[in-house]
């Protein structure tokens, strides 16, 4: 690694990043025929243009606007599932409940899911060695700004009843510093969104506590109510059974509480 290269605290760009983004884009247009008009080469060019040759601590939402424009997508606004610290279950759910969407079920979320990227000021190189860490280096890095931008837009698009899946195993079930807590909650539009319904996912088999009474959930309820949006909360005591019942709602065991 050349000496002059800035060393950041976070992992570097995911290997084969350009190839991965392009392959995912083409795959998405295959899986989602309604997006087949998308020009994946142009999408990659816009993605690249957002961070290449720019200081990776000085990225703005404006940098991502060309990509946002190309990735414009209409999802049913009343079928949105937000999540916080429980991505895998949220994605398993939307894979079964095909009419509901997480951010990662949209083109832009699908492209970037689990990837890291950054460039370097004044060079066209992608930095595969290290990228800024949100805490240790800077918050205005390419990855954080991307997720902030797409999360804001996703939340702004939501209407009617919005669902959010929260991890009941964590000390902070609702975390104000998460993307959900810091971006999505504040960008739900009260004139469009009637209710935010939280699903608190239990981790332990024998955990029968009502986690909807958790202080952090009460904090979420307070924030939401102040924004003139109704709040409701459900405990999901058995996530495995919950998924099974989404797959087979007629199953006789699915009438009891899950």
């Amino acid at each position: 690694v050349p000496r002059w290269r800035q060393q950041w605290s976070g992992p570097g760009t995911t290997k084969r990043f350009p190839e991965t983004v392009l392959a995912r884009c083409v795959k998405y247009t295959e899986i989602h025929p309604e997006m087949r008009h998308v020009d994946c080469q142009s999408v990659w060019d816009a993605f690249k243009g957002a961070f290449i040759s720019k200081h990776p601590c000085n990225i703005t939402e404006e940098d991502y606007q060309p990509l946002m424009k190309l990735g414009t997508q209409t999802v049913p606004c009343n079928k949105i599932l937000l999540w916080s610290r429980i991505k895998d279950l949220a994605h398993q759910f939307t894979q079964v409940q095909r009419d509901m969407f997480t951010l990662e079920d949209t083109l832009l979320g699908y492209l970037a899911d689990d990837l890291t990227w950054c460039g370097e000021f004044n060079t066209s190189k992608i930095n595969y060695q290290s990228c800024p860490d949100w805490r240790k280096d800077c918050s205005n890095n390419p990855v954080s700004v991307f997720w902030k931008t797409v999360s804001r837009r996703f939340a702004e698009a939501a209407c009617d009843v919005v669902h959010v899946m929260l991890n009941g195993s964590r000390s902070k079930i609702f975390d104000k510093n998460s993307t959900f807590g810091s971006v999505e909650v504040h960008n739900l539009q009260p004139e469009k969104v009637q209710t935010l319904e939280a699903w608190v996912i239990h981790g332990g088999r024998e955990d029968s506590r009502d986690l909807c009474q958790d202080p952090t959930i009460k904090e979420l309820e307070s924030i939401i109510s102040k924004r003139n949006i109704q709040f409701s909360c459900k405990n999901i005591y058995r996530p495995d059974k919950f998924l099974q019942c989404v797959k087979n709602p007629e199953d006789s065991s699915c009438t009891s509480e899950i």
């Epitope: 392009l22 392959a23 884009c25 083409v26 795959k27 247009t29 295959e30 025929p33 309604e34 087949r36 008009h37 998308v38 020009d39 994946c40 080469q41 142009s42 990659w44 209409t74």
Partner: antibody, heavy 115, light 107 residues
């Protein structure tokens, strides 16, 4: 510039198979899906299926499933459509097309099925 | 499969006329509709995608509208080079399907 060049016209007997090629140039072959569409003489357009040249995965119109096979050779940037158990109603011009906001189509390949 | 019913199947018009072609989908396809123009012996050419977006190089006299199940292609002022057959296509779900075509002829 972008070009999709298809193989020449074919005359086949009923029950035979035909393989039509579509050579792409002027763009990165793996960055776009390739559709196959046919048009019987004096008739409308009918979608046969598509291939993702990067992964090789395919989607077929149920009407053709079991009779059509779509493949792609990344090394030569060529897509292929093979149709088997040909019958007279398969007589048509077969087109390949690259997807996107500015799609490009091949010039078409006339396949005539006649005994 | 989603059926696309196009009307009329043919029409006669003069240069300068405003021409409207409609397409009805058998189920909701959102805005996932494209319009193609085809001239004899040639491959189809994309005019409109996502209901109302013109493809690159397509003249502004071509416009599309609609959503859900009802879609329209309008040629605001017919030019000599516009005499051709027009097809709608839905790409909201597989298999992709086309309308049966509308032939625009010289009056």
């Amino acid at each position: 510039q972008v070009q999709l060049v298809q193989s020449g016209a074919e005359v086949k007997k009923p029950g035979a198979s035909v393989k039509v090629s579509c050579k792409a140039s002027g763009y990165t072959f793996t960055n776009y899906l390739i559709d196959w569409v046919r048009q019987a003489p004096g008739q409308g357009l009918e979608w046969i299926g598509l291939i993702n040249p990067g992964s090789g995965s395919t989607k077929y119109n149920e009407k053709f499933k079991g009779r059509v096979t779509l493949t792609a050779d990344k090394s030569t940037s060529t897509a292929y459509m093979e149709l088997s158990s040909l019958r007279s109603e398969d007589t048509a011009v077969y087109y390949c097309a690259k997807t996107g906001t500015l799609p490009y189509w091949g010039q078409g390949t006339l396949v005539t099925v006649s005994s | 499969d989603i059926q696309m019913t196009q009307s009329p199947s043919s029409l006669s018009a003069s240069v300068g006329d405003r021409v409207t072609i409609t397409c009805k989908a058998s189920q909701n396809v959102g805005t996932s509709v494209a319009w193609y123009q085809q001239k004899p012996g040639k491959a189809p050419k994309l005019l409109i995608y996502s209901t109302s977006y013109r493809s690159s190089g397509v003249p502004s006299r071509f416009s599309g509208s609609g959503s859900g199940t009802d879609f329209t292609l309008t040629i605001s002022s017919l030019q000599p080079e516009d005499f051709a057959t027009y097809y709608c296509q839905q790409y909201g779900s597989y298999p992709l399907t086309f309308g049966q075509g509308t032939k625009v002829e010289i009056k």
